[in-house]
């Protein structure tokens, strides 16, 4: 005859083999995850007496030393957590839940999607056009995404002897700031106490070993008595432009 024991919600649960308590959370068996991300597998289970959970990788006991940085098991959440996954983490992960009455298991397949090297990507809408009065300060921001080390340059078109282009037809350019040992926060170009001469186009140019990307913004400098027209506020967009 079945025996009973008291569980936390004070209802009597018959003793027996483990069972899944939330199969919806387990429906997605194939997980494709970008490298360097955190992966979490859950196998919520119940059972009386309380079940224990073990994890296998490719059918064998999954030990901490099997991956750099190890992994975390949260028994109260029935979960396995692997941080900063790498290609060698690919494989089948099986949760094995057992008590004295029996065992159940569920297998997930992890595919680590390797990054593809690419030229820098700049966030859309940045840098944003700005306006200020003579003597004012202004800041341009360039948000860069690049797996490889990016080299950031802030460039402005300038005039020489009243000419915008050189004898070769190419525009005169001045590098105002670039990333390097002596340059902190290269993604931001700050201009202080601006004059009418500072008005014009500012280019954020970013390169890595693969290629380049650039985006530009315009600075309007108004006479002191004229208050600046507020630019429409830019909200960070999840979209990126190459």
């Amino acid at each position: 005859r079945p025996s009973f024991s008291l569980v936390e919600d004070t209802t009597l649960e018959p003793e027996g083999a483990p069972y899944w308590t939330n199969t919806e959370k387990m429906e997605k068996r194939l997980h494709a995850c970008p490298a360097a991300n955190t992966v979490k597998f859950r196998c919520p289970a119940g059972g009386n007496p309380t079940s224990t959970m073990r994890w296998l990788k490719n059918g064998k006991e999954f030990k901490q030393e099997h991956r750099i940085g190890g992994y975390k098991v949260r028994n109260q959440h029935w979960s396995l957590i692997m941080e900063s996954v790498v290609p060698s983490d690919k494989g089948n992960y099986t949760c094995l839940v057992e008590n004295e009455y029996g065992s159940i298991n569920h297998t997930y397949h992890l595919d680590v999607v390797e990054r593809s090297p690419h030229r820098p990507i700049l966030q859309a809408g940045l840098p944003a056009n700005a306006s200020t009065v003579v003597g004012g300060d202004v800041e341009f921001v360039c948000k860069v995404y690049s797996d490889a080390q990016p080299h950031i340059q802030w460039i402005k078109h300038v005039e020489k002897n009243g000419s915008k282009n050189g004898p070769d037809g190419l525009p005169y350019l001045k590098v105002l700031k670039h990333s390097g040992i002596n340059s902190s926060n290269a993604e931001v170009l700050a201009l202080f106490n601006v004059t009418e001469m500072d008005a014009g186009e500012y280019i954020c140019k970013v390169s890595n070993y693969i290629g380049q990307a650039n985006q530009s913004a315009w600075l309007t400098v108004l006479p002191k008595q004229q208050a600046p027209v507020r630019e429409k506020e830019i909200t960070a967009s999840p979209d990126y432009l190459e």
């Epitope: 690419h118 030229r119 490889a148 080390q149 390169s207 070993y209 693969i210 290629g211 380049q212």
Partner: antibody, heavy 114, light 107 residues
Framework: QVQLQQPGAEVVKPGASVKMSCKAS????????VHWVKQTPGQGLEWIGS????????SYNQNFKGKATLTADKSSSTAYIQLSSLTSEDSAVYYC???????WGQGTLVTVSV | NIVMTQSPKSMSMSVGDRVSITCKAS??????VAWYQKKPGQSPKLLIY???YRYTGVPDRFTGSGSGTDFTFTISNVQAEDLAVYYC?????????FGGGTKLEIK
Amino acid sequence: QVQLQQPGAEVVKPGASVKMSCKASGYIFTTYNVHWVKQTPGQGLEWIGSIYPDNGDTSYNQNFKGKATLTADKSSSTAYIQLSSLTSEDSAVYYCARGDFAYWGQGTLVTVSV
Amino acid sequence: NIVMTQSPKSMSMSVGDRVSITCKASQGVSNDVAWYQKKPGQSPKLLIYSASYRYTGVPDRFTGSGSGTDFTFTISNVQAEDLAVYYCQQHSTTPYTFGGGTKLEIK
């Protein structure tokens, strides 16, 4: 598929110049750097420099400044390297490679001899 | 210039052996390191990029690891066709520099 085509060999006299080509196909030529790499039996692999065909921006290894000039022709998707004042030290295989170094030309063997 | 010191210069291994090659950068290069295989008469072939990412189609016996200044390239189960020279390269800062190469010979 991505391809970088280079001539097989060039024989040149000391003091002369040579201009080698690297014709790209199978990808958007203007969106990747083109790198040039020198290989000699004694020195292994040496990065000469790169060009970004979209705007012609170049970056050189200081060791090759004045020796190598990189150019690119967008209309024909071809990158070029010109080597000047050649000496026996310049005898080597010269490779072009796409920006990500995932695709390489077959290399051009340059022989400097009288 | 960043110097990439690669060792050993050469090694002789048997089929099935595990091979490890190290590369030390003279200054930090984050994870901007690639590994190439160079066979005689062929152009270099990209195996690993960003220190640990296997390039498309590269067999999983080839692995890379490391960050900062110390990097390791491993072939876990050497095959006869792995006979080649292997190079590391940093692509963090110009000039992009290569290691001196490691010649792998098969016994």
